[in-house]
Structures are given as structure tokens and as C-alpha cells.
């Protein structure tokens, strides 16, 4: 039997200090450049080696960035999101969503994360 792929979604607050070339990650997404179909959110496409995000270690490629310094990133054009990061200041607080892929057992088998029983 084939296993079922589920996702464990968690949120985390990450505080980064801007380095000489920014916060050390690239973004994709926005209302004009959807990275995920039917989702105009802003996603991390690359963590730069030795950049602020890599040195912190918590932000991962594929994470969705929900807010920057408390400012929601919903329904933004790509360039407007970029401008938020560019102008966010020296100490930057990110609210991020991690989406961890979880491989469950065969369909019908209750996985560890199943709250029933």
C-alpha cells in the first residue's frame, strides 16, 4: 500500500540582524508572481551561505513569511514585499510558517500525530 504524505505546519518568530548584504535570503511570490498556485504569499527561495539567516539556522528554503516587524505580507505585489525587507531596519522580526513533510504509514493506519484514540 502506498503511504500518505501529510504536512505538519508550525509557526515561529525569528529575529535576524541585517548583515552587509541584507538578511541573507531570497524571496519569491506575491499577488503578481504566485509561487504556489492559489497562494499569493511570500516564500523563501534561497538561504545564502554565511548570511544572517544561515547563521541563525532557523529559516529554511520553502518557508512562508507571514509578517515582517509585525506587518502582514498578505496580498502584496512582489516588489512591495521586497521593499518591506529592504526598509525593515537593522533588527528584523519575521513571523514564518514552516511546512514539514511527514510520511505516514499505509492509508487507514493511524499515524502518531492522529489525535483520535
Amino acid at each position: 500500500m502506498n503511504g500518505r504524505v501529510d504536512y505538519l505546519v508550525t509557526e515561529e518568530e525569528i529575529n535576524l540582524t541585517r548583515g552587509p548584504s541584507g538578511l541573507g535570503f531570497n524571496i519569491v511570490g506575491g499577488t503578481d508572481q504566485q509561487y504556489v498556485s492559489n497562494d499569493s504569499g511570500i516564500y523563501v527561495s534561497r538561504i545564502k551561505e554565511n548570511g544572517a539567516a544561515a547563521l541563525d539556522g532557523r529559516l529554511q528554503e520553502g518557508d512562508k513569511i507571514l509578517s515582517v516587524n509585525g506587518q502582514d505580507l498578505k496580498n502584496l505585489l512582489h516588489q512591495d514585499a521586497v521593499d518591506l525587507f529592504r526598509n525593515a531596519g537593522y533588527a528584523v522580526s519575521l513571523r514564518v510558517q514552516h511546512r514539514l513533510q511527514v510520511q505516514n504509514g499505509p492509508i487507514g493506519h493511524r499515524g502518531e500525530g492522529d489525535p483520535s484514540g
Epitope: S21, Q33, S45, Q79, V82
Partner: nanobody, 126 residues
């Protein structure tokens, strides 16, 4: 310190070719979306060709089929191969990188990039 240094410009006849180079120091080129821009006297700056960190490319309509952007990650250098040059390609050519955007189209259309070179002059004239 992040630095971009362009070279390879010059005077060329219509129909000729040039290869521009942009050497990066202070950062790893393939971690960035980066591109080539040009500005002719009295005209607005124009995004010519850009490439994302994952290798997706964008070309302005005016250069499609004539110009090719490429990157050598070992030499940490960006290139622009320019063929079938026309007088209207005459301009000061710059390379520039975004610290955040990884969308090559947005980078080429942006007037808010983070690292710029000084430029190299390309003149197409007989």
C-alpha cells in the same frame, strides 16, 4: 564589501558582437538574482536581461534572440553575450543585484536594487 565591476564594452560596428563581464566580490554570485541594465543618454534606465539564483532568465523584447545572459559560478562572474548589435543598443551597461528578490522579471523591472556596478560603455556605430 559587496562590489560589482563591469568590463568588455567598446566601439563596435552594427552587426558586430561584444561580451560584457561583471565580476562580483564580497558575495557569492549564484546566491542572487542579478542582471544587466542599460541607460542611453536622455533615456530611462532599462532592464536588459536578468537571471534568478536558480537560473531562470528574462530578456527584454528588444534584445531577445540577440543577447544571452550567463553566469560562471567558479569565476563569480556574470556575462552578457551581445550579438547582431544595433545602433540603438548604444548605452552605458551596468550589472546590478537584488538582495531579496529571486524573481528575474521583477529584478529587471525594478528601480530599487541593492548593489550596482559603475558601468561599461557600449557604442554601436559605423
Amino acid at each position: 564589501e559587496v562590489q560589482l565591476v563591469e568590463s568588455g564594452g567598446g566601439l563596435v560596428q552594427p552587426g558586430g558582437s561584444l561580451r560584457l563581464s561583471c565580476a562580483a566580490s564580497g558575495f557569492t554570485l549564484d546566491d542572487y538574482a542579478i542582471g544587466w541594465f542599460r541607460q542611453a543618454p536622455g533615456k530611462e534606465r532599462e532592464g536588459v536581461s536578468c537571471i534568478s539564483s536558480h537560473g531562470s532568465t528574462y530578456y527584454a523584447d528588444s534584445v531577445k534572440g540577440r543577447f544571452t545572459i550567463s553566469r560562471d559560478n567558479v569565476k563569480n562572474t556574470l556575462y552578457l553575450q551581445m550579438n547582431s548589435l544595433k545602433p540603438e543598443d548604444t548605452a552605458l551597461y551596468y550589472c546590478a543585484a537584488s538582495y531579496y528578490s529571486d524573481y528575474e522579471v521583477a529584478v529587471c523591472r525594478s528601480d530599487a536594487l541593492d548593489a550596482w556596478g559603475q558601468g561599461t560603455q557600449v557604442t554601436v556605430s559605423s
